[in-house]
């Protein structure tokens, strides 16, 4: 299946050129997407090319500048947020990144009615998180780990919490592990639908062991970065959820929401909070051994001013074959009756599907079914449910958007996207306005990405929001590689793969092969998306074949494949990459003396283990920021898949699955090990231990560290990294420079 059908081919071969590394590093062929910033059922905001914030009304066709670039520039604003009453805008500047999602910033409030910044009772700086209430213009913000409330932007703040302390107590924002591995947000506070209540999490990290690493900077002495970071088996954060009435915050103060008894009996996590109405909230909890999740629906008791979570409104989700959920436990989408909800979880055949829960999980009505998976519920209206799945034509690496009519019986299903731009677009996401009056579709490929606006009732396309015309024109004289997505059937396992082939690929010739691997639980690498990246360059210019393979442990193909790796990470993921390589060799166009593997993060772990598998298949390989032992990685992530590193649980496999245990096996491969010294996520410790084991085994290897760089190796380090890896691979494959 050739996946670049939208490319316009220039018949004059001599005007075509191959991709260069410089093209990739400069982002020459990057694409744009258009996600409307919805502010109503028919209006959205968008930042224009000249940085004006423009309001568009789809129904009336009106558009106008709500905030000028001049105002934005006056405070060097890089972001904005309109209050729901449209009286104020917050302007965000001095962005300072912390971890994956978190950052601090300075906030200014601009009054749209008089065209001036609000003076008096200005916000402190830097703020860790700030947001408007869903209606009106109340503000909640987090400063120095405490939560504050303003009834109006110019009012003095009301302090909600007082116990916040750096690295100890976090209010309204997550600590490191909750941010990275559980919430996947920078915030841990949630307004009720009409802004009456504010719910927030408090994380107590007092007893959590601290990871410390040097940040070299420019000073005479390096700084030490300290992060409370629970590694596998270590003491975890203690979480509590509180709710405060924002109309009369001083009246009774924050009220704690009770934890379900079956959860509170041992270590547990809070996983998400969903407001249903102003006086009903849904909390999800998870046992530390992450195969039991409890969804608890709580109601406000006016008489006691407390939150009541009756046992009859507790819904248990349990996995007997793996962990609960996919990567995360799914969140509920409530229907209009404010008690029943839709949720994705495994059906009896082990495929993740949408279920409708009215009273108990046992009596759930299955809404979708089949040997494919429902992936995301976008929106539920009174008569429709919009979701994405990989059902169409049985390609797990595709995403199409479907509408199920829930207002009629039996419910009818319609694929909204399957036939829109079939060759160009097979991987969609969507963004819905209030009540799904309109929606934007963002197609990521396999052709050049395109974003379109649609009517929520008829699904009619209204207009193209972004079609990447400049990119399309720029690619007209580029010899892009060919891509195909196919599958291998091996011992009752289906291994989907993506192969990236040189432009003048000839099956009768032999090519060097590079395997790019991630392979982490519930991940997916083989996707029908557009990309012009480093591996595109390696195929286009350097004549390599690149392959990506989704083996056991990967997502969206059923629980059998997903949960195969449960409690034994580092075994089947590696086996399946090796199996695929053997199959590729059988295809006849791979030079079996020139095969390499590379990966980043979990992929660095898999590539290291593959190189040390003793198969003799790989000549060389690269591991960027690899995990080397699961005892070094975060508790929430690691224990989800591995259990605890204790004798009576799974310590043996923790020990057996390290990279260090296989140090001897690196003797016959060329190994390049790369890591940032300021990696807060996969600590430099991981690579330090690999290096130590290799030195102790007297095994030669190559290494590169990036001083003061985190897990992303961004900025100039990116250029250096890819240049360095290119040289390494070209040397390995005996390709001339």
């Amino acid at each position: 299946i050739v996946l670049r059908p939208s490319r316009v081919h220039n018949s004059e071969e001599n005007t075509m050129r191959a991709l260069t590394l410089k093209d990739i590093l400069n982002g020459t062929f990057s694409y744009k997407t258009f996600f409307p910033n919805w502010i109503s059922g028919q209006e959205y905001l968008h930042q224009s090319a000249d940085n004006n914030i423009v309001l568009y009304n789809i129904e009336t066709g009106q558009s106008y500048t709500i905030l000028s670039n001049r105002t934005m520039k006056s405070v060097n604003a890089s972001n904005y947020g309109l209050s729901p009453d449209r009286q104020f805008v917050y302007l965000e500047s001095d962005y300072s990144k912390l971890w994956r999602y978190s950052y601090t910033a300075t906030y200014y409030i601009y009054d749209l009615s008089n065209g001036e910044f609000v003076r008096g009772n200005e916000l402190p700086r830097p703020i860790q998180y700030l947001c408007w209430s869903p209606v009106g213009s109340k503000l909640a913000y987090v400063y120095q780990n405490n939560i504050y409330l303003k009834q109006r932007p110019g009012d003095p703040p009301f302090q909600i919490t007082f116990n916040g302390r750096e690295n100890k107590i976090f209010n309204g924002i997550p600590d490191w592990v909750y941010e990275e591995e559980m919430l996947a947000t920078k915030y841990a506070l949630w307004w009720s639908p009409n802004g009456k209540f504010l719910a927030y999490a408090e994380f107590n990290d007092t007893d959590i062991p601290v990871i410390a690493y040097s940040y070299y900077g420019d000073e005479q002495y390096p700084r030490t970065i300290n992060i409370p970071y629970p590694k596998a088996g270590a003491k975890n954060p203690v979480v509590r959820i509180f709710i405060i009435d924002t109309t009369y915050p001083a009246y009774v103060g924050p009220q704690e929401v009770p934890v379900p008894a079956m959860i509170a009996s041992s270590d547990y996590y809070f996983s998400w909070l969903t407001w249903v109405t102003d006086e009903r909230v849904c909390l999800q909890w998870l046992k530390r051994v992450q195969n039991v999740s409890v969804l608890s629906i709580c109601d406000f008791r006016e008489d006691w001013q407390t939150w009541d979570c009756p046992k009859t409104q507790e819904h248990i989700e349990e996995s007997r074959t793996g962990w609960a959920g996919g990567f995360f436990v799914s969140t509920p989408v409530f229907s209009y009756d404010a008690i029943s909800y839709y949720k994705i979880f495994s059906d009896k055949d082990g495929y993740k599907h949408i279920h409708y829960i009215k009273d108990t999980v046992e009596n759930a009505i299955q809404i979708t079914s089949g040997k494919w998976e429902a992936i995301n519920i976008f929106r539920v209206t009174q008569d429709s449910l919009f979701y994405s799945s990989n059902e169409f034509e049985e390609y797990p690496g595709r995403r199409n958007i479907y509408r199920i009519s829930i207002g009629s019986y039996p419910p009818s299903k319609k694929c909204v996207t399957c036939h829109l731009r079939k060759e160009r677009c097979q991987y969609y996401t969507a963004s819905f306005s209030d009540y799904a009056k309109y929606y934007a579709l963002v197609c990521y490929g396999p052709g050049i990405p395109i974003s379109t606006l649609h009517d929520g009732r008829t699904d009619q396309e209204i207009k193209i929001l972004e079609e990447n015309k400049e990119l399309e024109n720029a690619l007209k004289n580029i010899q892009l590689p060919k891509e195909e997505i196919k599958k291998l059937e091996v011992d009752e396992i289906t291994l989907w793969y993506k192969m990236i082939l040189p432009p003048q690929f000839d099956r009768s010739k032999k090519y060097p092969l590079l395997i790019q691997v991630y392979g982490g639980p519930c991940s997916q690498s083989v996707r029908s998306v557009f990309a012009v990246n480093w591996i595109s360059y390696l195929a286009s210019k350097e004549g390599m074949v690149i392959a990506l393979v989704d083996g056991r442990g990967t997502a969206f193909q059923g629980d059998k494949l997903l949960y195969a790796v449960y409690r034994k990470l580092g075994v089947y993921e590696v086996e399946d990459q090796i199996t695929a390589v053997r199959k590729f060799i059988e295809m006849g166009f791979i030079d079996e003396k020139r095969i390499a593997i590379w990966g980043w993060s979990y992929g660095g772990y898999v590539s290291s283990l593959a190189l040390a598998s003793g198969t003799g298949l790989f000549k060389c390989g690269i591991a960027v920021a690899p995990v080397s032992s699961w005892e070094y990685y975060a508790s929430v992530y690691t224990e989800r898949f591995m259990g605890l590193p204790t004798k009576d649980d799974n310590l043996e496999h923790y020990k057996n699955s390290t990279v260090m245990a296989r140090a001897e096996y690196f003797r016959n491969v060329d190994y390049l090990l790369i890591h940032g010294t300021a990696d807060d996520n996969v600590h430099f410790q991981n690579s330090a231990q690999i290096a130590k084991a290799l030195v102790n085994a007297q095994v030669d290897f190559q290494a590169m560290w990036y001083s003061d760089q985190n897990h992303g190796l961004s900025g100039l380090s990116t250029n250096h990294l890819y240049t360095h890896m290119t040289h390494f691979l070209k040397q390995c494959f005996s390709l001339s420079d």
Epitope: I39, Q62, I66, R86, N194, Y435
Partner: antibody, heavy 123, light 107 residues
Framework: QLQLQESGPGLVKPSETLSLTCTVS??????????WAWIRQPPGKGLEFIGN???????YYNPSLKSRVTISVDTSKNQFSLKLSSVTAADTAVYYC???????????????WGQGTLVTVSS | DIQMTQSPSSLSASVGDRVTITCRAS??????LNWYQQKPGKAPKLLIY???SLQSGVPSRFSGSGSGTDFTLTISSLQPEDFATYYC?????????FGQGTKVEIK
């Protein structure tokens, strides 16, 4: 406190053009938060939305009147105006200018109204 | 356009009575509904917005309820100053449309 005041002739002949102006005081018409609207009410009948305008001049007209309506804005005078062409007796009404306030998610209500001006179409 | 239908079109009541006016939308408008009171020769005055939120300064005897297509304005104990015409208005879809009005008269 925001105030709106309609002005214009109270009598217009059939087939001519009705012209009204709304003067805004106590606030700026250049406020980018809101639209400015015209609404009318025939004697003894209900209210009908005519159209709106933003400070930038961007307009929307009720489809039922679209072919005959023009709304314009003059930010220097803090005014916006209505022109309704080819009037008939059916256009006899009290004409109000109004401004909404927003609650959330685009949910708005008309919080500010002029006192209204009666325009009679008669020869 | 969304049609707004009020009932009754008029009603007679006494001071102290509980009065209920209903408004039906031709399609679902969620809670995008407002209620106004209009006295002769005056502009409409906002009472209730977003179906159930009481506008500041409006007496608490006025209340609103409903969602989707059916809405109610209730005056718990009618006062002499409440004799007027009441209009509902939707802001869910453009153009905004009003009900034809309900006239509350003295019995």
């Amino acid at each position: 406190q925001l105030q709106l005041q309609e002005s214009g002739p109270g009598l217009v002949k059939p087939s001519e053009t009705l012209s009204l102006t709304c003067t805004v005081s106590g606030g700026s018409i250049s406020s980018s938060s809101y639209f400015w609207a015209w609404i009318r009410q025939p004697p003894g009948k209900g209210l009908e939305f005519i159209g709106n305008i933003y400070y930038s001049g961007s307009t929307y007209y009720n489809p039922s009147l679209k072919s005959r309506v023009t709304i314009s804005v003059d930010t220097s005078k803090n005014q916006f105006s209505l022109k309704l062409s080819s009037v008939t007796a059916a256009d006899t009404a009290v004409y109000y200018c109004a401004r909404p306030s927003y609650y959330g998610s685009g949910n708005y209500y008309f919080a500010f109204w002029g006192q209204g001006t009666l325009v009679t179409v008669s020869s | 356009d969304i049609q707004m239908t009020q009932s009754p079109s008029s009603l007679s009541a006494s001071v102290g009575d509980r009065v209920t006016i209903t408004c039906r939308a031709s399609q679902s408008i969620s809670s995008y509904l407002n209620w106004y009171q209009q006295k002769p020769g005056k502009a409409p005055k906002l009472l209730i917005y977003a179906a159930s939120s009481l506008q500041s300064g409006v007496p608490s005897r006025f209340s609103g309820s409903g969602s989707g297509t059916d809405f109610t304005l209730t005056i718990s104990s009618l006062q002499p100053e409440d004799f007027a015409t009441y209009y509902c208005q939707q802001s869910y879809s453009t153009p905004p449309t009003f009900g034809q009005g309900t006239k509350v008269e003295i019995k």
